[in-house]
Amino acid sequence: DAHKSEVAHRFKDLGEENFKALVLIAFAQYLQQCPFEDHVKLVNEVTEFAKTCVADESAENCDKSLHTLFGDKLCTVATLRETYGEMADCCAKQEPERNECFLQHKDDNPNLPRLVRPEVDVMCTAFHDNEETFLKKYLYEIARRHPYFYAPELLFFAKRYKAAFTECCQAADKAACLLPKLDELRDEGKASSAKQRLKCASLQKFGERAFKAWAVARLSQRFPKAEFAEVSKLVTDLTKVHTECCHGDLLECADDRADLAKYICENQDSISSKLKECCEKPLLEKSHCIAEVENDEMPADLPSLAADFVESKDVCKNYAEAKDVFLGMFLYEYARRHPDYSVVLLLRLAKTYETTLEKCCAAADPHECYAKVFDEFKPLVEEPQNLIKQNCELFEQLGEYKFQNALLVRYTKKVPQVSTPTLVEVSRNLGKVGSKCCKHPEAKRMPCAEDYLSVVLNQLCVLHEKTPVSDRVTKCCTESLVNRRPCFSALEVDETYVPKEFNAETFTFHADICTLSEKERQIKKQTALVELVKHKPKATKEQLKAVMDDFAAFVEKCCKADDKETCFAEEGKKLVAASQAALGL
């Protein structure tokens, strides 16, 4: 499907509005520090050029690749060296090395100011004054803070963002209408960003085979009635879409995702009975809906897996003929029978099966050797089951905040070298697994919990990769994608850690804590808890609980005081002294 001009091809396919939105996302994800106005100018220049190519595909430069065109445009930014430092060196390279260089400089934790939400009336005025600029700003601000956000999905978020303002800015109580919607979009957006970040990490760090294995398992759970050939086709197409988006090829990615949604809906009879409602929706909603669709019912009377994968005399012959196809079929058959397992567990089982066949098919009596392979699965299945049972019991006993605190202590003791903000962010997210998954019945707990934990631990891995400080984190993050969670679970207290020097400033609080939201106040307290553990990694749960209870009482008391600042200064000194004594600091 060769086109004389790739830029003209994509411009015509997508239309101008989608083209401009996606180019803006791409540029903002690459140059995360550039001002909005500069990006808009670059996007307009690219769009005008695309139009000349639509008019005449033979015009000068129209035959260049999108990477060449976009890279050349990014490299015209005057302040590249001052703003981005060594990223400017990318511009001396030729494609495809230049794009790879830009990708390597994407920053998962850019030094950008927190997004402060203006007053509702101010937002509504801005929305009415220039709807297009308002929405472009949204795309820009999200894209630069989340450089791996799934671009076609960001269009869906922008559409919902627009709908919220369209509805709520004419409501009687604008704030009551708008704020919950914006909160929901923010929370969903963070979750979507983290899920996509895992997909990109999977592709970039572990390769296409790892991603395809994940996709086979997940799609087989979701579409258990689909034939293996159908699932394989969907996996191939989905891998192409995510490879493109993770590689910065956002126009191709969005175009291919639209084609995939169209294909799925045209072939839903051979894919899943659950797609009907999704397929009646407009494109952006439809694609989102398909990605989130519930698992179809398992076909009745599926035969035992053992017949084809253990008992058959042709196991080694079938494996030798096409190893990945045979393993893919094993994964498909196992996954479609087990919607109650996490994808990572299914992948561990497939890896165990593969290792067994590699060993046994070279043995004197292969069948005798692999006959008990399914017995090896039992401990692999029980480990996450037990872990989830224990942690859900703890969550139900403590509630979310205190459960997060338990995890903060646990993880700070495991990897105390990791920065406090990262430990707080990751542990808070790990703790959310309770509210998210423990409410589910047994059959849904493991896929919910363990696959969510994979997403959260990937956040730890990508943040740690930027400034590595712990060999243990590096080891768990890089050795095996599917064993990350068991690797972190198995870590004990780091006995090599030298406790941090005590710094009273870390535990000095001011009256401004009183005006913070409940969430922000929790983060302040949890930051203090991590610092405490870093000072005293051998502190017992009871000691830490006592100090935290005292701290909560201190904040409550001083926030009720007439002279808050004096209270924080005087009572704060007493609290620090009492805490030092309690912990033996």
């Epitope: 997508l14 239309g15 509005e17 989608n18 401009k20 627009k162 175009d255 407009p282």
Partner: nanobody, 131 residues
């Protein structure tokens, strides 16, 4: 949501004319770029023509340029396809489609020309050109 109903198809001799109409009901019609696609028996659905939200920008596939004209009347929630100098190879089911996108850009933005970027579809109207 938007419902689209095509009309105006029929049997016509080569060289003749037809005017297809597509009436939209539901949400604000001017929020959508509109397109016409066609599907001949045993073939893929193909793009014919599209028009921007304001009607200021129009696009045609090469094989119909100079013969077909797309237009819209936002007051009547209708899009039209005037087909002149019809040829037997124009025989197909003609579908009207609406593309919403973000619906926030300029009303003259170029619409998408690919079927998978359209959000809503009509049931189609048969056009048969005999030789």
């Amino acid at each position: 949501d938007v419902q689209l109903v095509e009309s105006g198809g029929g049997l016509v001799q080569a060289g003749g004319s037809l005017r297809l109409s597509c009436a939209a009901s539901g949400r604000t019609f001017s929020s959508y770029a509109m397109g016409w696609f066609r599907q001949a028996p045993g073939k893929e659905r193909e793009f014919v023509s599209a028009i921007s939200r304001s009607g200021g920008s129009t696009y045609y596939t090469d094989s119909v340029k100079g013969r077909f004209t797309i237009s819209r009347d936002n007051a009547k929630n209708t899009v039209y396809l005037q087909m002149n100098s019809l040829k037997p190879e124009d025989t197909a089911v003609y579908y009207c489609a609406a593309a919403e996108g973000l619906a926030s850009g300029s009303y003259d933005y170029t619409p998408p020309l690919k079927s998978s970027w359209y959000d809503y579809w009509g049931q189609g109207t048969q056009v048969t050109v005999s030789s």
